[in-house]
């Protein structure tokens, strides 16, 4: 089956959600782990990740079509300490499959705002920290 991973971000007030989405077939969920790393160029693993999600096969989902599983990492207030390069990854303990998403970055600027770059073009985000709105 075709398995892929995508990264996205969304903002709710001052909160920034970093989202790792894995598309997979229902039967491939078992043994899969999705994880998010920061500033890890070569050693991104569940053990070195900020957060991980172990997928479970959901018997309630009918059919054999593609389904998605999401790991969401929420930062309540982005600070300069969050500046860095992030990557969504996934691996299967059963099949040995390893997925690595594109690198994306959070940059906290001197004006007190921050930008998220490296996501799909429509998801290049620029946030005003104080206002908590898209600028």
């Amino acid at each position: 089956g075709c398995i892929n991973i995508t990264s996205s971000a969304s903002q709710e007030g001052t909160r920034l959600n970093l989202i790792c989405t894995v598309w997979h077939k229902k039967e491939e969920a078992e043994g899969f782990v999705v994880f998010l790393c920061k500033d890890r160029s070569g050693d991104c693993s569940p053990e070195t990740s900020l957060k991980q999600l172990r997928l479970k096969r959901d018997p309630g989902i009918d059919g054999v079509g593609e389904i998605s599983s999401q790991l969401m990492f929420t930062i309540s207030q982005v600070t300069p300490l969050h500046s860095g390069t992030y990557q969504c990854c996934a691996r299967s303990q059963k099949s040995g499959i390893r997925l690595q998403g594109h690198f994306f970055s959070i940059l906290f600027t001197e004006t007190g705002n921050y930008t998220v770059t490296g996501l799909k073009q429509r998801q290049h985000l620029e946030f005003s920290h104080n206002e908590g709105t898209l600028s």
Epitope: G13, K38, T48, S76, Q77, L81, S83, T85
Partner: antibody
Framework: EVQLVESGGGFVQPGGSLKLSCAAS????????MAWVRQAPKKGLEWVAS????????YYRDSVKGRFTISRDNAKNTQYLQMDSLRSEDTATYYC????????????WGQGVMVTVSS | EIVLTQSPTTMTASPGEKVTIICRAS?????MHWYQQKPGASPKPWIY???KLASGVPDRFSGSGSGTSYSLTFNNMEAEDAATYYC??????????FGAGTKLELK
């Protein structure tokens, strides 16, 4: 169990130097921003400096900029605070603390180490 | 720099009494955190992001507020609650600031 153990405190004259260390265990040290928070005798808490995970970017309160240097050694699971040109107003208990990654609270604190600056 | 002013500075409460501690910010802030510190001990996270209880904190405690006014409340004062409580916030560029503390004693 998360443990933060500070060392290196002591008595020093104004203008002198000290280097504090904080040995961390029980968590993936390299993933977390670290900081120092101090408390003067019978006084409140005061953030001193922070260092980010990854690139190790550093941030300081205005009163210590140019005098204090925060650093970390991820291989040794240790963070440091080099304190130079010490003043009497730097006298305090210095706590090693971890930054919560998802929030702006300091979630783990060491037992603290006393620094006394006096002639 | 945002200044946090706590009131009262010190207070005495009887067992079972309802206690409220106020933290006022000089400008609007997004969240307030609270710590408990007992004599000779390190501070402990008590409430984070205004209203969420830290791990192990009894549910008689609660936090609320928005803008420039935040509060820490506990419904039934117990002997173990006697401590100093500090509020804390983050903003840019002054980063992390704390209130001066409220010392709570058992009557």
């Amino acid at each position: 169990e998360v443990q933060l153990v500070e060392s290196g405190g002591g008595f020093v004259q104004p203008g002198g130097s000290l280097k504090l260390s904080c040995a961390a265990s029980g968590f993936t040290f390299s993933n977390y921003g670290m900081a120092w928070v101090r408390q003067a005798p019978k006084k409140g808490l005061e953030w001193v400096a922070s260092i980010s995970s990854g690139r190790g970017n550093t941030y300081y309160r205005d009163s210590v900029k140019g005098r204090f240097t925060i650093s970390r050694d991820n291989a040794k699971n240790t963070q440091y605070l080099q304190m130079d040109s010490l003043r009497s107003e730097d006298t305090a208990t210095y706590y090693c603390v971890t930054h919560n990654y998802e929030s702006t609270i300091f979630d783990y604190w060491g037992q603290g180490v006393m620094v006394t600056v006096s002639s | 720099e945002i200044v946090l002013t706590q009131s009262p500075t010190t207070m005495t409460a009887s067992p079972g009494e309802k206690v409220t501690i106020i933290c006022r910010a000089s400008s609007s802030v997004s969240y307030m955190h609270w710590y408990q510190q007992k004599p000779g001990a390190s501070p402990k996270p008590w409430i984070y992001e205004t209203s969420k209880l830290a791990s192990g904190v009894p549910d008689r405690f609660s936090g609320s507020g928005s803008g420039t006014s935040y509060s820490l409340t506990f419904n039934n004062m117990e002997a173990e609650d006697a401590a100093t409580y500090y509020c804390q916030q983050w903003n840019y560029p002054s980063m992390y600031t704390f209130g001066a503390g409220t010392k709570l004693e058992l009557k």
